[in-house]
């Protein structure tokens, strides 16, 4: 009989698990890109927007060569958890403008959750430690205004897009080293 219910089975092929994570990440990247474009269409952004509570981008062209699987998966999961909280916050704190994007934001949140579960599973199959975030999650305060929440939405979607873009590259590179 197989392993007891609820215990992670050790994957015979971690590359297949990684493939599946890459597929989910790519799919989420496409959704994010589409929603970010919708945002720009509906609520044109005047320049770049940032949000102090968002994680800083973990990867860059210079760091790609030195990536290690445990570090990438851990950091990616921590960052995506932060983006998950931000999307959840956006949906709850939004005024009527963003409520018009509620179905898309809801779907994005659900897919983010699915990717987080997949990464968690991948980490347990690879027997990697389930690292907790460095610091406890800071409660997100209310946007200063409706315009503030629109700017926040631009920042969240833009940051998530960049994070997922680098995640796909990083995961694909790591797959070649497995």
């Amino acid at each position: 009989p197989g392993p007891p219910a609820g215990s992670p089975r050790v994957s015979s092929d971690p590359r297949a698990d990684l493939d599946s994570a890459v597929l989910l990440t790519r799919s989420l990247l496409a959704d994010t890109r589409q929603l970010a474009a919708q945002m720009r269409d509906k609520f044109p952004a005047d320049g770049d927007h940032n949000l102090d509570s968002l994680p800083t981008l973990a990867m860059s062209a210079g760091t790609l060569g030195s990536l290690q699987l445990p570090g990438v998966l851990t950091r990616l999961r921590v960052d995506l958890m932060s983006y998950f909280r931000h999307v959840q916050w956006l949906r709850r704190a939004a005024g009527p403008s963003l409520k018009t994007l509620e179905p898309e934001l809801g779907a994005l949140q659900a897919r983010l959750e699915r990717l987080l579960r997949r990464l968690q599973l991948l980490m347990s199959r690879l027997a990697l430690p389930q690292a907790a975030p460095d610091q406890p999650a800071v409660p997100l305060g209310p946007p200063a205004s409706a315009w503030g929440s629109i700017r926040a939405a631009h920042a969240i979607l833009g940051g998530l897009h960049l994070t997922l873009d680098w995640a796909v590259r990083g995961l694909l590179l790591l797959k070649t080293r497995l």
Epitope: A93, P96, S97, K99, G141, P142, A144, S145, W147, S149
Partner: antibody
């Protein structure tokens, strides 16, 4: 400081129209979504309508849909509520309220609308 | 009939702690922030609690909000005579695409 002042209330016959105004000052009006909330005499609060900061998105309560229109003029820092086909049950104090997102942080003092023949 | 359900009245003596409940559903309280407003007789409502449990500046820490699932509550400790007012809970409702209020709770401070 933030100020919201409603005007335009009064006594009107059923079936007639009325336009309420809300003059805003003390903040950047064009950055905030705005709502109308009403309160019938001796009753609770009832949400009426909301308009987004730019005026492009509007939502209405079922009880006023098709009869009331919310609008704004950001150049004049003014919010409006055009009320047509008024009914006796529309009699209430009408408040305008500012929202940064999901809550009303500032309210006007209200203007009374009485629909009576 | 209000979408959010509150008890019509509540009472307490000075110094006591009172709690006002607000019950909703997954489309309002369950998925959006809850806000509480205080309306003193003859005046406009005033924001008391927002984002489920945050207090605007100027609101005493005797007032606190909490939420669990599809219900929320407002607690007032160290009750004072000036707390006598109507209290309303409110939230956005995703199904109705609008703001919903509770029917209001009239708080009486006895003695």
């Amino acid at each position: 400081q933030v100020q919201l002042v409603e005007s335009g209330g009064g006594v009107v016959q059923p079936g007639r129209s009325l336009r309420l105004s809300c003059a805003a000052s003390g903040f950047t009006f064009s950055h905030y979504d705005m709502h109308w909330v009403r309160q019938a005499p001796g009753k609770g609060l009832e949400w009426v309508a909301v308009i987004s900061y730019s005026g492009s998105v509007k939502f209405y309560a079922d009880s006023v849909k098709g009869r009331f229109t919310i609008s704004r003029d950001n150049s004049k820092n003014t919010l409006y509520l055009q009320m047509n086909s008024l009914r006796a049950e529309d009699t209430a104090v009408y408040y305008c309220a500012r929202t940064p997102g999901s809550h009303f942080d500032y309210w006007g003092q209200g203007t009374l609308v009485t629909v009576s023949s | 009939q209000s979408v959010l359900t509150q008890p019509p009245s509540a009472s307490g003596t000075p110094g006591q702690r009172v709690t006002i409940s607000c019950s909703g559903s997954s489309s309002n309280i369950g998925s959006n922030y809850v806000n509480w407003y205080q309306q003193l007789p003859g005046t406009a409502p005033k924001l008391l609690i927002y984002y489920d449990d945050l207090r605007p500046s100027g609101v005493p820490d005797r007032f606190s909000g909490s939420k669990s699932g599809t219900s929320a509550s407002l607690a007032i400790s160290g009750l004072r005579s000036e707390d006598e007012a109507d209290y309303y809970c409110s939230a956005w409702d995703d199904s109705l695409s609008g703001v919903v209020f509770g029917g209001g709770t009239k708080l009486t401070v006895l003695g």
